[in-house]
């Protein structure tokens, strides 16, 4: 008799999940000399241990502590780029501006980027059929808790001037319910962080509005101010030109506003 399996609303674990995590770990540690000491098998075991045999709606940050410990990494605290709803451009930027880092440029972020995973209570099986959806099922699922944990730690580590890239094409440029809005903003430490600088990325070619005056940006400014941190905001009117100028700062067209 086939065992009854819980049906969740979200997609199941990414196929070949264990192999993908292990392969990514090996690749990352080869490319980043400061992480060469990391034992990728131990990393996988700790990752697996966080969710295997556990109810996928009862995951806690503590479950991920062994993985966090193994993935401890020092990034320059004044070179952190946060992002919200504009991951691709943020990653394109740090690929060019190599001294800046998004969460996905760290080992733990790199391992989990774009992946889904969950297990089942009391079995050692990975659930490839379905996993809990944050809204429809539960918020304390393996993926959400992982990102909440690593995002909190990443924000807590930041110092000096922290940058955040925001999507100016969305109805809520700053969204309190995003990981940035619900976790990272509230874990920036004012004893270390002097300023949060928002880069609002424009979508339309002819969009010359000052999106820094958007009500949701004012909301972000308010939260940051309440945390005793300065806030500044810049419009990036031409993201294509912005990237081009990061690549070639000497270009004569790069002195004008982007």
């Amino acid at each position: 008799v086939p065992r009854w399996r819980q049906q969740w609303s979200g997609p199941g674990t990414t196929k070949r999940f264990p192999e993908t995590v292990l392969a990514r770990c090996v690749k990352y540690t080869e490319i980043h000399p400061e992480m060469r000491h990391v034992d990728c098998q131990s990393v996988w075991d700790a990752f697996k241990g966080a969710f295997i045999s556990k109810h996928p709606c009862n995951i806690t940050e503590e479950d991920y502590q062994p993985l966090m410990k193994l993935g401890t990494q020092t990034v320059p605290c004044n070179k952190i780029l946060l992002w919200s709803r504009i991951k691709d451009l943020a990653h394109q930027f740090t690929q060019v501006q190599r001294d800046m880092f998004t969460l996905e440029d760290t080992l733990l972020g790199y391992l989990a980027d774009d992946l889904t995973w969950c297990g089942e209570f009391n079995t050692s099986k990975i659930n490839y059929q379905s996993c809990p959806d944050w809204r429809k099922d539960c918020s304390n699922n393996p993926v959400s808790v992982f990102w909440k944990t690593v995002s909190r730690r990443f924000a807590e580590a930041a110092c000096d001037v922290v940058h955040v890239m925001l999507n100016g094409s969305r109805s809520k440029i700053f969204d309190k319910n995003s990981t940035f809005g619900s976790v990272e903003v509230h874990n920036l430490q004012p004893e270390k962080v002097q300023t949060l600088e928002a880069w609002v990325i424009h979508g339309g070619r002819e969009d010359s509005r000052d999106l820094c005056q958007d009500p949701t940006i004012k909301e972000l400014e308010s939260i940051i101010s309440k945390r005793n941190i300065q806030f500044s905001c810049k419009n990036i009117y031409r993201p294509d030109k912005f990237l081009q100028c990061v690549k070639n700062p000497e270009d004569s067209s790069c002195t004008s506003e982007i």
Epitope: K176, P190, Q194, P215, S222, N228
Partner: antibody, heavy 123, light 107 residues
């Protein structure tokens, strides 16, 4: 325990300057921003602005730009409000208040207030 | 600037009765509303912070609800010690703005 202690009452003439102090104790001064709130006699509360206790950068509500200045003496855990060229309508009680925050939005609020400093402007 | 309209300006109730104060904001402020109590000659005291959160040490007879533009503050079983002015404060965007206040008296 946490306390914000403000300087005593002031009686001033129009055109003069007043400087009110707000001394914090019982917590790390540089950790929390300091707000200033005005209350005219028999009237409600008005947020004047805040000062970043790390950087010393002030932010003023539109109505309080110009004659009003927030400053700090960090070594003494003290915030100051200075009002220049005093006018009769500046007669009020002025409060300092710390903006508290935690790692969740529900913790954010002006939690500790000074006892208030009464400023009377009269010729 | 977000304006905050508070009502009523004053009210008088018997002890044990329920008190309801309302604040309406001119813009959507999510649940970034705070409620303060001010007794004569004293500074305001926070009762409820953002997210309709009762502050530590504040009696549970005080509560609030609301989201967006419409907010309600309630005192169940009012006591004589609740005589005070009550203010709402929106902290969603600067400049932060207070409601005009409500003077609570006991009959």
């Amino acid at each position: 325990q946490i306390q914000l202690v403000q300087s005593g009452p002031e009686l001033k003439k129009p055109g003069e300057t007043v400087k009110i102090s707000c001394k914090a104790s019982g917590y790390t001064f540089k950790k929390y921003g300091m707000n200033w709130v005005k209350q005219a006699p028999g009237k409600g509360l008005k947020w004047m602005g805040w000062i970043n206790t790390n950087t010393g950068e002030p932010t003023y509500a539109e109505e309080f730009k110009g004659r009003f200045a927030f400053s700090l003496e960090t070594s003494a855990s003290t915030a100051y409000l200075q009002i220049n060229n005093l006018k009769n309508e500046d007669t009020a009680t002025y409060f300092c208040a710390r903006w508290y925050y935690g790692s969740t939005p529900s913790s954010y609020t002006m939690d500790y207030w000074g006892q208030g400093t009464s400023v009377t402007v009269s010729s | 600037e977000t304006t905050v309209t508070q009502s009523p300006a004053s009210l008088s109730v018997a002890t044990g009765e329920k008190v309801t104060i309302r604040c309406i904001t001119s813009t959507d402020i999510d649940d970034d509303m705070n409620w303060y109590q001010q007794k004569p000659g004293e500074p305001p005291k926070v009762l409820i912070s953002e997210g309709n959160t009762l502050r530590p040490g504040v009696p549970s007879r005080f509560s609030s609800s609301g989201y967006g533009t419409d907010f309600v503050f309630t005192i169940e079983n009012t006591l004589s010690e609740d005589v005070a002015d009550y203010y709402c404060l929106q902290s969603n965007n600067m400049p932060y703005t207070f409601g005009g206040g409500t003077k609570l008296e006991i009959k």
